[in-house]
């Protein structure tokens, strides 16, 4: 079937394949210190690591991509590790009228897959 | 704001940045010749190319990733070029009872962005 089972065990060794990793960043790092008040520091979960053949395939397209990359590595790139879902984050920020809260749905990754 | 405008002009030169490219593949290439009858050959649109800073950013997370990659390139990978949408494709395939048609929603990319 088009939906071959994506692999969930990493053939490259521990921590090498696509996974969620926490990166600490300040508002200064993000260039947000002029408008965001809080939190001053964010634990930003990001997707890092390699995507070996069929590892955590996002969908049929990713499975095809993995296969064609094996056949034509110069023409077709390997799938890469990107967020599959996000955790909403609330930021307290300055507005013209004072301080406001806003929730961002697409800021911190919650899960990763190979697309 | 968190939503800096993603760039749409490629600073690396024509065809170098994230874009849609057609790859021709046979059923044999895909390993589907035993169950798919038609089409015998697929024009598979795929996302290829690099993702320089803020080029076609998928969302806020991708913008952050691009910025942190500039600050910590060994720790944070650059965003990568993945499908933003798909074109459905109808395949004619064998079943236990004969031949059937099935639409696959996630097989051929229609648009790309940097995630």
């Amino acid at each position: 079937s088009a939906h071959a089972h994506p692999r969930d065990s990493c053939p490259l060794g521990p921590g090498r394949c696509c996974h969620l990793e926490t990166v600490q960043a300040t508002l200064e790092d993000l260039g947000w210190s002029d408008w965001v008040l809080s939190p001053r520091q964010l634990q930003l979960s990001m997707c890092v690591g390699e995507c070996p053949h069929l590892y955590r395939s996002a969908n049929t397209h990713a499975q095809i991509k993995a296969r064609l990359h094996g056949l034509q590595p110069d023409k077709v790139p390997a799938p890469c590790c990107v967020p599959s879902s996000y955790t909403p984050v609330v930021l307290m920020h300055r507005t013209d009228s004072g301080v406001s809260l806003q929730t961002y749905d697409d800021l911190v990754a919650r899960g990763c897959h190979c697309a | 704001s968190a939503h800096a405008h993603p760039r749409d002009s490629c600073p690396l030169g024509p065809g170098r940045c994230c874009h849609l490219e057609t790859v021709q593949a046979t059923l044999e290439d895909l390993g589907w010749s035993d169950w798919v009858l038609s089409p015998r050959q697929l024009q598979l649109s795929m996302c290829v190319g690099e993702c320089p800073h803020l080029y076609r950013s998928a969302n806020t997370h991708a913008q952050i990733k691009a910025r942190l990659h500039g600050l910590q390139p060994d720790k944070v990978p650059a965003p990568c070029c993945v499908p933003s949408s798909y074109t459905p494709v109808v395949l004619m395939h064998r079943t236990d009872s004969g031949v059937s048609l099935q639409t696959y929603d996630d097989l051929v990319a229609r648009g790309c962005h940097c995630a």
């Epitope: 809080s38 984050v89 809260l101 806003q102 929730t103 | -």
Partner: antibody
Framework: EVQLVQSGAEVKKPGESLKISCKGS????????ISWVRQMPGKGLEWMGI????????IYSPSFQGQVTISADKSISTAYLQWSSLKASDTAMYYC????????????WGQGTLVTVSS | DIQMTQSPSSLSASVGDRVTITCRAS??????LNWYQQKPGKAPKLLIY???NLQSGVPSRFSGSGSGTDFTLTISSLQPEDFATYYC?????????FGQGTKVEIK
């Protein structure tokens, strides 16, 4: 154990002032925001406002702006809700809640402080 | 300000019943909605965050769905301890607001 402990029930007269407290323990107090929620007798929950204890930034619901003051003392891991002049309509249960900015939810709640204002 | 409208305001159900509570926002709030349960004399308790994510320790019979303006809390098989009042809460942007509550009573 992570918890928020609120001060005890209060009975006051209209026009009096009041400050109730919410003490956090078992976690880093400045890593989370604190919200206050009102529940009038037999009624639903109302969001009053929020404070960031690390920078003492506050945001109020328009319904409560100018009616109450939210503050915090990070040195003793305590948030406060205060009134300068109570009204009978302030009679309610008041809850403090810890706010996780990841997810935006109120994950830990105080036990509530019942405030009764009556002449 | 965003208004949150819950329906029904109350319902009677039996143990084992499937119960559905809906919440409508006056404007789109993406998936920025939480559900809380409150029992008499107790502080509220988080059930669902980000519209569909089950809080740790909450039984799997509770589920949430929806996005934009329309949201649903479902209890697949009502248990005796589920008789309570349920509130939706939007946190898309301040001022945050609760729905008026849905009281689930024993039939």
């Amino acid at each position: 154990e992570v918890q928020l402990v609120q001060s005890g029930a209060e009975v006051k007269k209209p026009g009096e002032s009041l400050k109730i407290s919410c003490k956090g323990s078992g976690y880093s107090f400045t890593d989370y925001w604190i919200s206050w929620v009102r529940q009038m007798p037999g009624k639903g929950l109302e969001w009053m406002g929020i404070i960031d204890p690390s920078g003492s930034y506050t945001i109020y619901s328009p319904s409560f702006q100018g009616q109450v003051t939210i503050s915090a003392d990070k040195s003793i891991s305590t948030a406060y809700l205060q009134w300068s002049s109570l009204k009978a309509s302030d009679t309610a249960m008041y809850y403090c809640a810890r706010v996780s900015y990841y997810g935006g939810y109120f994950d830990i709640w105080g036990q509530g402080t019942l405030v009764t204002v009556s002449s | 300000d965003i208004q949150m409208t819950q329906s029904p305001s109350s319902l009677s159900a039996s143990v084992g019943d499937r119960v559905t509570i809906t919440c409508r926002a006056s404007q789109s709030i993406s998936n920025n909605l939480n559900w809380y349960q409150q029992k008499p004399g107790k502080a509220p308790k988080l059930l669902i965050y980000a519209a569909s994510n089950l809080q740790s320790g909450v039984p799997s019979r509770f589920s949430g769905s929806g996005s934009g303006t329309d949201f649903t809390l479902t209890i697949s098989s009502l248990q005796p301890e589920d008789f309570a009042t349920y509130y939706c809460f939007q946190l898309d942007h301040s001022p945050f607001t609760f729905g008026q509550g849905t009281k689930v009573e024993i039939k």
